[in-house]
Interface confidence: medium
């Protein structure tokens, strides 16, 4: 199961496994979270680093994207986009199931596209 990269500014987790075992590296933001030694302030920073190096989970909570004829939702980040290879761009697509569209009528105008074979909001491209 592969997942799109997480563009987070929270590196509050340390890896206690090998590179192969770990599922991702959260971008480091020393001002936000303590270092491995446990020191550091807990304060928000407005310009997050975007240094993801391995696939990380991403659920489809995105700003409204222009409607296109597609069955996938392209996650759009409000942080200035980085140049991506076609492979990286493909990772950004998130598949949704029909069941996830059974929402309150007020939410039906949200820009979510469905794909029959995919089973969940959080599930990534297999």
């Amino acid at each position: 199961e592969s997942r799109a990269e997480l563009t987070s500014d929270k590196d509050m987790y340390l890896d206690n496994s090998s590179i192969e075992e770990a599922s991702g590296v959260y971008p480091i933001d020393d001002d936000d979270y303590a270092s491995a030694s446990g020191s550091g302030a807990d304060e928000d920073v407005e310009s997050p680093e975007l240094t993801t190096s391995r696939p990380l989970p991403k659920i489809l909570l995105t700003s409204a994207a222009p409607k296109v004829e597609t069955t996938t939702l392209n996650i759009q980040n409000k942080i200035p986009a980085q140049t991506k290879s076609p492979e990286e761009t493909d990772k950004e697509k998130v598949h949704l199931s029909d069941s996830e569209r059974k929402m309150d009528p007020a939410e039906e105008d949200t820009n979510v596209y469905t794909e029959k074979h995919s089973d969940s909001l959080f599930k990534r491209t297999e």
């Epitope: 199961e1 987070s8 929270k10 599922s23 928000d44 989970p57 659920i59 700003s63 949200t110 959080f122």
Partner: antibody
């Protein structure tokens, strides 16, 4: 200190409505997806709902779909949970929690939790 | 929904003991698993995400392992402050689901 404070809990009769609020401080609230998670007395944790950083996307746990509505006012740094058609099984401590991810990204897990507010549904 | 099964549901241990809690997912979730600690009357506290990644400030005696359907949280040498209830949570598939919890009590 990064903080979340829930308010609005109390005792309510079955079938009635209640709105919970969660005030955020010391972080840029508008950058984060936010969740509600609940815990019935003596029981485990149950995810209730999530809302995107800008409020455009909302998703719910099966047991509350169609009855609960999650919303947010970023200008007020406040998250809400409107609970309608309350049932006895909705009795729980309700926690708001910040998603680990920032911006349009949300991971589906949580780093910062509030202290919780108790909701009791009883006639 | 994916069912998360924790075992044991409770255990008694002594300070200094090595404790392992397991969490099984009803279907594969990759490494998208988190562990939380909760003490009575308090909110849960994040310990680990992505199955193995320890939150800064959490003592290194806590470690996570596993992927797919089988996961474990290990406390290498139990301290008095570690007596609490521990929950696993999967975030690969909606709806997000938690394990039933494991209560670690003083022997």
């Amino acid at each position: 200190e990064v903080q979340l404070v829930e308010t609005g809990g109390g005792v309510v009769q079955p079938g009635r409505s209640l709105t919970l609020s969660c005030g955020a401080s010391e972080f840029t609230f508008s950058n984060y997806a936010m969740h509600w998670v609940r815990q019935a007395p003596g029981k485990g944790l149950e995810w209730v709902a999530v809302i995107s950083y800008d409020g455009t996307k909302k998703y719910y746990g099966d047991s509350v779909k169609g009855r609960f509505t999650i919303s947010r006012e970023n200008i007020k740094n406040t998250l809400y949970l409107q609970m309608n058609s309350l049932r006895s099984e909705d009795t729980a401590v309700y926690y708001c929690a910040r998603d680990v991810g920032k911006g349009v990204t949300a991971t589906g897990t949580f780093d910062i939790w509030g202290q919780g507010t108790m909701v009791t549904v009883s006639s | 929904a994916i069912r998360m099964t924790q075992s044991p549901s409770s255990l008694s241990a002594s300070v200094g003991d090595r404790v392992t809690i397991t969490c099984r997912a009803s279907q594969g979730i990759g490494s998208y698993l988190a562990w939380f600690q909760q003490k009575p009357g308090e909110a849960p506290k994040s310990l680990i995400i992505d199955a193995t990644r320890l939150k800064s400030g959490v003592p290194s005696r806590f470690s996570g392992s596993g992927s797919g359907t089988e996961f474990a949280l290990t406390i290498s040498s139990l301290r008095p402050e570690d007596f609490a209830t521990y929950y696993c949570q999967q975030y690969n598939v909606s709806p997000l689901t938690f394990g039933g919890g494991t209560k670690v009590e003083i022997k």
